[in-house]
C-alpha cells in the first residue's frame, strides 16, 4: 500500500531571465527512493538515481542545474518556461509518486511564490 | 558533442589497452557515460557504465577486466590482457540507464587485438 | 538478469511498405525500451526512447509501442534510408546483465 505523499512549491512564478527552484518532497512512506525524475510534459529534464547521481538531459544541459538535494534549478527562463513540470520518484517497494509543479514566467514585475501544498 | 580521443589500433594481448572519450562543451559532472562494443559483423553489446558520482556497472562478462574511470570531461576504458575476442569498435555515449536511451554516441574506433 | 530478445534477425520490405521489428523482455521492464538505427561505418542514432517516444529530428514514419515485456518498433511508409540494422535496448536494470541490447535486426529495402 502507497501511504507516502508528495509536497511540492506549488504553483511558481518567475522572472525572464532569472532562475527558479523545483523541488518536491516525500514524506510518510519508509519506501526506498531509488530514482528521482524532473520532467516537463514528455520530455526528460534530469534525474537523480540513487546509485549513479545525477544526469542532466543533453538539450537542457547549459539551463538546469542539479540540487539543492533532489530539487532542480532552472536558469535563463524565458516564457518558453511556463507550464507544467513533474517530480516522478521511483521507490521501492511502493513504486511512483508524481508531484506537480506549475511555473509561470514573466516578462518583468517581481516573482511571487505560491503556496506549498500536497498531492497525494 | 562526444569524441573517441584516442586512436585503435593494433594490440598485443600482453598490452594494456586504454579508450579516452572526450566530452565537449559541457562537464560530465551531470552526465551518465557508457561504453559499447561491436565485433565485425555482430551486434551491439554493453560493456559499462560511470555515473557522475563516479559509481560504475559492467556487463558481468566484463567485470575484473575492463575498467571505467572519469575525470571533468573524459572517460577512460581500460581493458587488462585483451584477447582476440576483444576486437570490435569501442563507441562512448551519453547516458544510459534510465536517461531516456543513450544519446549522441562517439563515432568509434576499431581495437584489433593480435599476438 | 534481463534478457532482450529481438525478432526476426532480418526482414525484407519494399519501399512504401511497413516493418514491424518485436523485442521481448525476459520479465518486465516498464517500459524502459529505446531503438537505435544503425548504417554501416556509423555509430546507433536514437530514434525511440521510453518505449514510444520519438527522438528529436526523427521522422514521424517510425513509431514505438508495448509495455511490460513486450514492445515493438514499426516503420510505415518506409524509404530507401530506412534500410539500416535497428536495435532495441532495455534501461530498467543494469546489475546482473549480460546485455541491455537485442541482437539487432537488419532492415532490407528493395
Known amino acids: 500500500m502507497m501511504t507516502g505523499t508528495i509536497e511540492t512549491t506549488g504553483n511558481i512564478s518567475a522572472k525572464k531571465g532569472g532562475s527558479v527552484i523545483l523541488q518536491c518532497h516525500l514524506s510518510s512512506t519508509t519506501a526506498q527512493v531509488t530514482q528521482v525524475n524532473w520532467e516537463q510534459q514528455d520530455q526528460l529534464l534530469a534525474i537523480c538515481n540513487a546509485d549513479l547521481g545525477w544526469h542532466i538531459s543533453p538539450s537542457f544541459k547549459d539551463r538546469v542545474a542539479p540540487g539543492p538535494g533532489l530539487g532542480l534549478t532552472l536558469q535563463s527562463l524565458t516564457v518558453n518556461d511556463t507550464g507544467e513540470y513533474f517530480c516522478i520518484y521511483h521507490t521501492y517497494p511502493d513504486g511512483t509518486y508524481t508531484g506537480r509543479i506549475f511555473l509561470e514566467v514573466l516578462e518583468s514585475s517581481v516573482a511571487e511564490h505560491g503556496a506549498r501544498f500536497q498531492i497525494p | 558533442q562526444v569524441q573517441l580521443e584516442s586512436e585503435g589500433g593494433l594490440f598485443k594481448p600482453t598490452d594494456t589497452l586504454t579508450l579516452t572519450c572526450t566530452v565537449s562543451g559541457s562537464s560530465l559532472s551531470s552526465s551518465y557515460m557508457s561504453w559499447v562494443r561491436q565485433a565485425p559483423g555482430k551486434g551491439l553489446e554493453w560493456i559499462g557504465i560511470?555515473?557522475?558520482?563516479?559509481n560504475t556497472y559492467y556487463a558481468n562478462w566484463a567485470k575484473g577486466r575492463f575498467t571505467i574511470s572519469k575525470t571533468s570531461t573524459t572517460v577512460e576504458l581500460k581493458i587488462t590482457s585483451p584477447t582476440t575476442e576483444d576486437t570490435a569498435t569501442y563507441f562512448c555515449?551519453?547516458?544510459?540507464?534510465?536517461?531516456?536511451?543513450?544519446?549522441?554516441w562517439g563515432p568509434g574506433t576499431l581495437v584489433t587485438v593480435s599476438s | 538478469d534481463i534478457v532482450m530478445t529481438q525478432t526476426p534477425a532480418s526482414v525484407e520490405v519494399a519501399v512504401g511498405g511497413t516493418v514491424t521489428i518485436k523485442c521481448q523482455a525476459s520479465?518486465?521492464?516498464?517500459?524502459?525500451l529505446n531503438w537505435y538505427q544503425q548504417k554501416p561505418g556509423q555509430p546507433p542514432k536514437l530514434l525511440i526512447y521510453?518505449?514510444?517516444k520519438l527522438a528529436s529530428g526523427v521522422p514521424s514514419r517510425f513509431s514505438g509501442s508495448g509495455s511490460g515485456t513486450e514492445y515493438t518498433l514499426t516503420i510505415s511508409g518506409v524509404e530507401s534510408a530506412d534500410a539500416a540494422t535497428y536495435y532495441c535496448?532495455?534501461?530498467?536494470?543494469?546489475?546482473?546483465?549480460?546485455?541491455?541490447f537485442g541482437g539487432g535486426t537488419e532492415v532490407v529495402v528493395k
Open positions: 520479465q518486465s521492464i516498464s517500459s524502459y
Open positions: 560511470i555515473g557522475s558520482n563516479g
Open positions: 521510453d518505449a514510444l
Open positions: 555515449a551519453r547516458g544510459g540507464y534510465r536517461t531516456s536511451g543513450m544519446d549522441p
Open positions: 535496448q532495455q534501461e530498467h536494470s543494469v546489475g546482473n546483465v549480460d546485455n541491455v
